[in-house]
């Protein structure tokens, strides 16, 4: 039960985190005009990864996309790449984790397979969260570096002109969304990895040893009482296609990397 809860919670936390990473990536407010100790402009400038915007005093807002790829700073490109990689990994992780959820039964998928998928999705979430945190942190560092520069824009030459008005930029809302979202995705991934350990086929303490037909080598797991045949054949005269409704001792246990954790 605790494993299912941990896995489910990990999935939900990661889902929220990835939604946040997507939101942060799409947001325009990665950097916002610093209003403190600055010339008071009648327009408010803010910039995202994909476009820059201006809000006029009337509230009218106009945005312009960065219609150049080569003209953009390498750091901005790197941040874009990190965020996209984070989203892609997170999306794949979500897809994998849906099938790995213990509460969802798909065909005759075994616990070991679900454990593998849970671990895979957990690792994906961790990497996704790290990508987002790294991307946001790189951008934040870029802002701090440029904050004291005398040029008007953080991206000199991006607009084709350098303003003489010293517009300084500070952290925008997207940075905080990105940090929180990346953190949530990371936490969700860790929870999935923890859940994976509990999902690995556990050694069940049977009151009696299962006896199999002679002629088969019987392998006993160290420290456990669960027996399994060396060949994985169906030793009882039962239909194999029983729709997945097998008794516990009918399920064949195969060694996996989780068995000796």
């Amino acid at each position: 039960m605790a494993v299912t809860a941990c896995q489910g919670l990990g999935f939900v936390v990661s889902l929220i985190g990835i939604a946040g990473i997507i939101a942060a990536t799409c947001m325009d407010q990665w950097s916002t005009q610093d209003l403190y100790n600055n010339p008071v402009t009648a327009v408010f400038n803010y910039q995202g990864l994909w476009r820059s915007c201006v809000r006029e005093s009337s509230g009218f807002t106009e945005c312009r996309g960065y219609f150049t790829l080569l003209g953009l700073p390498a750091m901005l490109q790197a941040v874009r790449a990190l965020m996209i990689v984070g989203i892609v990994l997170g999306a794949i992780g979500l897809l994998v984790s849906i099938f790995a959820l213990k509460c969802i039964r798909i065909g005759s998928m075994e616990d070991s397979a679900k454990a593998n998928m849970t671990l895979t999705s957990g690792i994906m979430f961790i990497v996704s969260g790290l990508c987002a945190i790294a991307g946001v942190s790189v951008f934040a560092n870029m802002l701090v570096t440029n904050f004291w520069m005398s040029t008007a824009n953080m991206y000199t030459g991006m607009g084709g002109m350098v303003q003489t008005v010293q517009t300084r930029y500070t952290f925008g809302a997207a940075l905080f969304v990105g940090w929180v979202a990346g953190g949530l995705t990371l936490i969700g991934g860790v929870m999935m990895c923890i859940a994976c350990r509990g999902l690995a086929p556990e050694e069940t303490n049977y009151k009696a040893v299962s006896y199999h037909a002679s002629g088969h080598s019987v392998a006993y797991k160290p420290g456990g009482f669960k027996a399994s045949t060396g060949f994985g054949s169906n030793t009882k005269n039962k239909k194999i296609y029983d729709g997945g409704a097998r008794t516990e001792d009918e399920v064949q246990s195969y060694p996996s990397k989780h068995d000796y954790v």
């Epitope: 402009t41 803010y46 820059s52 915007c53 201006v54 005093s57 607009g159 002109m161 003489t164 008005v165």
Partner: antibody, heavy 119, light 113 residues
Framework: EVQLVESGGGLVQPGGSLRLSCAVS????????MHWVRQAPGKGLEWVAY????????YYADSVKGRFTVSRDNAKNSLYLQMNSLRAEDTAVYYC????????????WGQGTLVTVSS | DIVMTQSPDSLAVSLGERVTMNCKSS????????????LTWYQQKPGQPPKLLIY???TRESGVPDRFSGSGSGTDFTLTISSVQAEDVAVYYC?????????FGQGTKLEIK
Amino acid sequence: EVQLVESGGGLVQPGGSLRLSCAVSGFTFSSFGMHWVRQAPGKGLEWVAYISSGTTNIYYADSVKGRFTVSRDNAKNSLYLQMNSLRAEDTAVYYCVRSGYYGNSLDYWGQGTLVTVSS
Amino acid sequence: DIVMTQSPDSLAVSLGERVTMNCKSSQSLFSSGNQRNYLTWYQQKPGQPPKLLIYWASTRESGVPDRFSGSGSGTDFTLTISSVQAEDVAVYYCQNVYIYPLTFGQGTKLEIK
């Protein structure tokens, strides 16, 4: 039709005070920022003050800072300019102006009210 | 404060003639965020309040005849009247609407010969 009607101008002694009013009609007053602009007789235009639609942002020209106060009453569709410590150089026609939706332009102007500061 | 300087102070032209007047700002009025220049042109006829002609340095206000056009970027701007009419006699002002205080130029007076 957009209409801006200024009132409250007149003759005042140096050091005196005056309160200008601007009655607005023909548009949703609470949605627009408003400016005061003045023009000394035979001279050019001088921007005086700005107040945003929700009074969050208020800006003044250096020449009037600390002496003039701009305010608005959205319920009464009215804009005000409280002028204290008046000087001879404040003598001008004062225009109430609406801040346009695009380009921070000053799109609708009142007819103006004359303020004369003289002893 | 941004200083706006207009030239010439006055000019006299014949009807139908093309006229240009200039406005120079002490700082750039260009906003890279939306690639716009925050400069506005006004026309003030004798005894009347000013009237908005052009905003964003080159966008005509609705109802303004197309003989009026604005151009320029950064610190240098121009107002052009392609074919001067009698009703164009006025003083033309440019204004910085980018940084407070929103300063005006001293004006260019247009007269007919």
